[in-house]
Structure formats: C-alpha cells, structure tokens
Interface confidence: medium
C-alpha cells in the first residue's frame, strides 16, 4: 500500500497507519484487513460507516488522533477491539448497534463528563471496559447491566464521588476493577457482592471512616491479597499487594482496613462489626466460610407508584436497621422522632414481596437453619436467617430514573436518639399463642413499632415517626389502592431459640417501613 | 516497559524435546497476541509460532508439526504462552525471544509491541 504498511499476523491481515498526518482514512486498503491501526493522525471527526467495506476488521485503533466526534453508523460485525484512547472526545457514543461483538473498548483519557443512560446497552459481548483519566462525577443507574460478560473495568483517574451501589450485579466473570485516584469517599453495602475479585485498585480515594465504612472495611479483611496499589515511577511500572494503600482520609492516612468503628451502634453487646456485614449468600473460599447474616433479598425493579418511582433496591440487612440500645416499650422524648443518618435505610419497601394478615394465623415452628459461625476475630451474633431469594439483576433504568440514594449531610442540630412511642389504646395483635408473650430482650430481635402514617417523598431519607399505630393501619392509610393486605408470600426461616414468640417473625411484625 | 520473562532453553540432542515458557507480569491485563520467534547466528529473526486472544495459531512451515504453541486460560496467568518443541533439529539452535502486541495495562498504559531477552536454544546432534 502508498502509504500504510501491511503486514501478515496468523491468519490476520494487519494494516499500519500510524503517525501518518492522516485527515481521513486513506482509499485502497485491503478488504481482508483484519486489523487496523490508525494511531497519532489527526482525523478530528471519524465515520464508522467508512470502514463497512471491510468485513473482516476486528480490531481498530484510533488512539490519539484528535477527535472530537465519532460518527456511529452502519454495523462493523466482527470489530473486537476498538480503542479511542487520548482524544478529546466529551460524550459516549452509544455502539450497541454498530458494534454487536465488541469485547475490549478502551475510552481512557478522554473528556467524558457522563455517561447516558443506556451507554453499553447492545454489548453483550465487552469484556473490557477502559475509561481511566475522564471527567467522570457519576455513573448511570444500571451502567454495566447489558455488558454481563466483563471481566476488566477501569474507571480510575475521574472524579467519581460515589458509585451506584449495584453496580457490579451480575458480572461473575469481573476479576480486575480499578477504582484508584477518584474522590470516592465510601462504598455502599454490598457493592461487591459475593464473587471473588481478584485485582482491585482502590488506593489515591479520600476514604471517609465512620460508620459508613465498616462494610468495606471489612470487605477490605476479607480480601486484602486482592488490594493491589499500582506504582509508576521513571523506569519501572509495577503493581503489588498491598491492604494498607486504602487509607482514611479524615484520620490521618490511617488504612481503612484497621479502622476500630469505635462509637458505632451495635446489637446488644455481640460486637460492633457484624452489624455491618454483608455477603448475599454463603461463600466457601477453601476453609473459610461466611455466614449468611438476615438479609432481606428484594427483586430489584423499578415500581411506578402514585408517589413517583420507587427503586426497590437489590438487597438490605435486617441487622443494619435494629437501632442500638431500643427498649421496645421506650417512652418517646419528642413528638417527632427522626433517625439519624447511619440508620437511614438504603432501600424502598417491594409491596408485593412483603406479607401483613389482619388475622393472625397459627403457624407450625420453622424449620431451623444450620448456624454457621462466622470467622475469626470477630464473632457473629446468633442472628435470623431469611430464606435466600435468586441474586437480582440491576434493572434496566427508565425514562426517569429515580435519584441515587445519598446520605444526608447532619443539620446543626443533632438527631436524638431514636425511641419507640408508647402502644395507643388499639394496640397491634398479640401472637397466635393465647398466653402473653414476654417483651424480648435486646440481646434477640426487639419489638419496633414505627408508626408511617405519612408516607415520605422519595427524596427524603429521614424516617419521621409521629403518633403510633400498628403496622398494618399505617399500610393500609399510606398505600390507598391497597383495599386488602398484601397476602404472605414468604416464609422467614429462622435459628434463634424463641423463634415462635419472636416478634420479628410475626407476620403484623414481618419488617421496618423505612420510605 | 512491558517485561517479558523466558524460561526453559538449554541444550537438548537431536529428536530431543523441550517446552519454552513466557510470562507478561500481572500489571498487563490484557494482551491481544503472544509469539515466539527466533534468531540463528548471521540470520534474520523468524517467526516461529504465534497465538492470538481468541486462540488462532499460526507457524513457520520449518516448525509445523513438531512445534505447539498453547496459551493459559486461568485468570491469574492468562498473559503466559508456551512453545512446545519435540523432534528438535540441529537447525534449530537458535535464541528465541518472546513477543507481546497489543498490550494493555492496570495503569492505563497501552503497548504496541514488546520482546523478551531471549533464551538459548542449542540441538546437537
């Protein structure tokens, strides 16, 4: 060829452009061109479509050519590979349709602000996904769900301050994630979910270590021979393990692993960590087995409502809304009742996966689950174990999508602590048993009343509890279409000793409406 | 710099056999083909045997059927080729040095090419 020079790799036919101060792709190329690498020309605007008479193309390279705007026409069947690296490009073009069996798209160094929603929507086939050294703030709800099959993602060097907590759903195959150098401050609970991930990039993040934290910290234990810390110095690029890289940023570089959790609440006196935990399901790595913890599994999907969209989001421990230190016969101190930021719930109730019967019904004893206890050092508490539910996917996000959930920043004036209100005169029905069951100790489940007799915006995260009412009434007044109560469609499996007279298991107990 | 690290030449006599290996550190996460090649005294430098990531091979006429060239799967060591070598001949004493292209890296870092340091290769016969 004139001007590019064509070589033979395999059975791949491997055509070289390169620094050819190149405007537009150069006539006469071969047909059969494999792969092609326009690298370093300055096309400042490129067409898909133009490469369309090249059947065979499966890697294309147009790293560092000056574009502004990629043109997303025509299919390119078999293209692999295609890398857009170091060019000015300021929005994602969505590929889907012109690059069906894309595995490896590199975007890196680019001047991504967002992404659309819906960006990867199409590549079912990526495998690696490279946008390291962008603008990034925030991600898209449901980002990664219709790329199912990755393995390498890089979104290091941007400016994420948080990541939309079901993120990786559903990436069995994920083995490399590279979160360095953002300005993430926490991760929410059960980001990681429960699949080993052998590479992970997290140091150069202003690590917030409070409460918050704890779930990473311990996913941070669990996991330390996968923390790696990237290193590049003059003449040597390296990686190596290395725990202690993730660091607190408001504790003077203390790493998050060792972070103590001091002053955070806890259940009972059984250890301030287990609170916190959170592995979907039971993993056996070798000897080291998890235990399951009381986790409430919701399929995740997006609810129309009368009130707006409710995201019922993917998972939520049971565990994690116990308030510390809650007699369940506390007399309230306020008429108002909020709880503070480390409790607010981070997930919408799904009305049709939740059970309330206006009769009690009798019930045979459930059926024990097996105790495992979790490793050492940190003992688990005897907890309740929910029946698992299938691992939910991350829904494809809609037209207009819900706010991701934020903490909200503490006002001037502290929270008190929350409190439960004394019964009013209709109190909630007694268990099936005809004797009076004894109010349960803290050390088990307590007993919580929280009244919702208004039902809260989306965009408040504030639980406010006002007079008390049972349970089943507050439904019933908030939700108006519910004629009847939704009907049990679960079964709780449980291990504690008191399990029939427990009144978590009591279906007009069955669970906090937190909104 | 993406380093390559050979193992496994020597000195083998003639219908003899030997496995050359070849590892890209763990840093580069992703690397489109790995090969080897080889280069006699006074002679070019020859392909020998390349491997692509979806597994296509192909080989030197001199090489076919007597030379395999595999590549491992597992995750943790997914950048390592081999070269199989039986019914070694005296013409193929020669150093072989390991090639890496298209190489992508944990920092963000992108290679066209890379070579290994060589490693000795001596059939007697």
């Known amino acids: 060829h004139p001007i590019c020079e064509v070589s033979k790799v395999a059975s791949h036919l491997e055509v070289n452009c390169d620094k050819r101060n190149l405007t537009a792709l150069p006539p006469d190329l071969p047909k059969d061109t494999t792969i092609l690498h326009l690298s370093e020309n300055l096309l400042y605007t490129f067409s898909l479509a133009t490469l369309m008479p090249y059947t065979r193309l499966t890697q294309l390279n147009l790293d560092r050519c000056e574009l502004t705007k990629l043109q997303v026409d025509g299919t390119l069947p078999v293209l692999g590979t295609l890398d857009l690296s170091h060019n000015q490009l300021q929005s994602l073009p969505l590929l889907g349709q012109t690059l069906p069996a894309l595995t490896v798209l590199d975007v890196s160094f680019n001047r991504l602000t967002s992404l659309p929603l819906g960006a990867l929507r199409g590549l079912g086939e990526l495998q690696e996904l490279y946008l390291k050294g962008n603008e990034l703030k925030t991600l898209p709800p449901g980002l990664l769900t219709p790329t199912p099959k990755l393995e390498k993602l890089s979104l290091a060097n941007n400016n994420l301050t948080e990541l939309p907590a079901g993120l990786l759903n559903g990436l069995e195959n994920l083995d490399t994630l590279l979160l360095q150098e953002n300005s993430l401050y926490t991760i929410p609970k059960g980001f990681f979910g429960s699949h080993l991930l052998p590479f992970a990039f997290l140091h150069g993040n202003p690590w917030l270590c409070n409460c918050e934290i704890l779930y990473f910290r311990r996913w941070l234990q669990d996991n330390a021979e996968n923390v790696y810390v990237w290193k590049q110095g003059v003449d040597v690029k390296a990686m190596t393990s290395n725990v202690a890289s993730v660091q607190c940023d408001n504790s003077d570089k203390f790493p998050v692993y060792k972070y103590p959790g001091k002053g955070c609440p806890t259940l009972g006196d059984e250890g301030d960590t287990d609170l916190y935990d959170y592995y979907p399901e039971e993993d056996t790595e070798g000897d080291k087995v998890r235990a399951t913890r009381t986790v409430v599994k919701f399929p995740t999907k997006a609810h129309t409502t009368p009130w707006g969209l409710f995201y019922s989001w993917s998972t939520a421990s049971l565990d994690s809304q116990m308030p510390s230190s809650l007699h369940p016969t506390q007399e309230s101190t306020k008429e108002q009742t909020t709880f503070p930021p480390r409790w607010t719930p981070n997930f919408t109730l799904h009305m049709e996966s939740i059970t309330f019967s206006k009769t009690p019904k009798s019930t045979t004893e459930p059926t024990p689950s097996p105790t495992t206890s979790e490793p050492v050092p940190e003992p688990a508490p005897n907890m309740t174990t929910l029946e698992p539910t299938p691992s939910p996917t991350t829904p494809e996000p809609t037209s207009e999508p819900a706010p991701s959930p934020t903490t909200p920043e503490p006002t001037s004036e502290p929270a008190p602590s929350p409190t439960t209100p004394e019964p009013t005169s209709e109190p909630a029905p007694s268990p099936t048993t005809p004797e009076p069951t004894p109010i349960p100790t803290i050390a088990t489940s307590p007993t919580i009343l929280v009244s919702a007799t208004s039902l809260i915006t989306p965009k408040s995260t504030f639980l406010t509890t006002t007079k008390p009412v049972s349970l089943l009434e507050s439904t019933k007044k908030t939700i108006p279409e519910l004629d009847q109560p939704p009907k049990l469609r679960g079964v709780l499996q449980g291990h504690l000793e008191s399990s029939r007279n427990d009144p978590f298991l009591h279906p007009d107990f069955c669970c906090l409406l937190p909104l | 710099e993406v380093q390559l690290v050979e193992s496994g030449g020597g000195l083998v006599q003639a219908g003899g056999s030997l496995r050359l290996s070849c590892a890209a550190a763990a840093s580069w996460f992703s690397i489109y083909a790995m090969g080897w090649y080889r280069q006699a005294p006074g002679k070019q430098r020859e392909l020998v045997a390349i491997i692509l990531s979806d597994g296509d091979t192909d080989y030197a006429d001199s090489v076919k059927g007597r030379f395999t060239i595999s590549r491992d799967n597992a995750k943790n060591t997914k950048n390592t080729v081999y070269l199989q070598m039986n019914s070694l001949k005296p013409e193929d004493t020669a150093v072989y040095y390991c090639?890496?292209?298209?190489?992508?890296?944990?920092?963000?870092?992108?290679?066209?090419?890379?070579w290994g340091q060589g490693t000795q290769v001596t059939v007697s016969s």
């Open positions: 090639n890496a292209r298209g190489i992508r890296g944990s920092g963000g870092d992108y290679a066209r090419e890379a």
